[in-house]
Interface confidence: low
């Protein structure tokens, strides 16, 4: 039976040009994490290996920085990246937990924050 | 190989502060971030703040906003968390932690009068 919960940075907004983390926590299970996916919508940002350590997808390596801890750093962001992205995590013996947010790349100062953590 | 060592803990009464540090060595990477996690006894370890390494982005729990701030200083391989207005619920072991998984051994924080 899945018991575990993810909890997620939620609905966020970054300026043009800024960088924003991208934090899920997987809790309330004693599953081994296996591995960690991130994707914008269907496209496959990183992946963290529990055994083989991160890879950056190619297309992302000069503007996604691995971390902290299985966290997601995107820089030098532009208003394309606004959109979906997805925390997978794969786990034993539980299964696949999935955890969104929804970022927002804006051109002004203007600051939505998520309910869970908050992204200056 | 990375390590990290935290210090800094120790015992505080409500509403004192406290300056943790974690300072990294034998690191190459120039593009990485730092995140601060606590465990309180009997419970799973928590998110509490992170910071890219150039100091762009950061990130807060909503239980420490406003209360406390992570900050990195390059030049030292170090990051910082302080921590303002602490609360007896802030007592537990924190650890600072990178994106390969290593952690540091930990400092104990105990807020108590």
């Known amino acids: 039976m899945m018991t575990g919960t993810i909890e997620t940075t939620g609905n966020i907004s970054a300026e043009k040009g800024g960088s924003i983390i991208l934090q899920c926590h997987l809790s309330s299970t004693t599953a081994q994490v296996t591995q960690v996916n991130w994707e914008q919508q269907d496209q496959l940002l990183a992946i963290c290996n529990a055994d083989l350590g991160w890879h950056i997808s190619p297309s992302f390596k000069d503007r996604v920085a691995p971390g902290p801890g299985l966290g997601l750093t995107l820089q030098s962001l532009t208003v394309n990246d606004t959109g979906e992205y997805f925390c997978i995590y794969h786990t034993y013996p539980d299964g696949t937990y999935t955890g969104r947010i929804f970022l927002e790349v804006l051109e002004s100062s203007v600051a939505e924050h998520g309910a869970r953590f908050q992204i200056p | 190989e990375v390590q990290l060592v935290e210090s800094g803990g120790g015992l505080v009464q409500p509403g004192g502060s406290l300056r943790l540090s974690c300072a990294a060595s034998g690191r190459t990477e120039a593009n990485y971030a730092m995140g601060w996690f606590r465990q309180a006894p009997g419970k799973e370890r928590e998110f509490v703040a992170a910071?890219?390494?150039?100091?762009?982005?950061?990130a807060y729990a909503d239980s420490v906003k406003g209360r406390f701030t992570i900050s990195a200083d390059n030049s030292k391989n170090t990051a910082y968390l302080q921590m303002n207005s602490l609360k007896p619920e802030d007592t537990a072991v924190y650890y600072c932690g990178d994106y390969e998984g290593h952690w540091g051994q930990g400092t104990l924080v105990t807020v108590s009068s």
């Open positions: 910071i890219s390494w150039d100091g762009g982005a950061t």
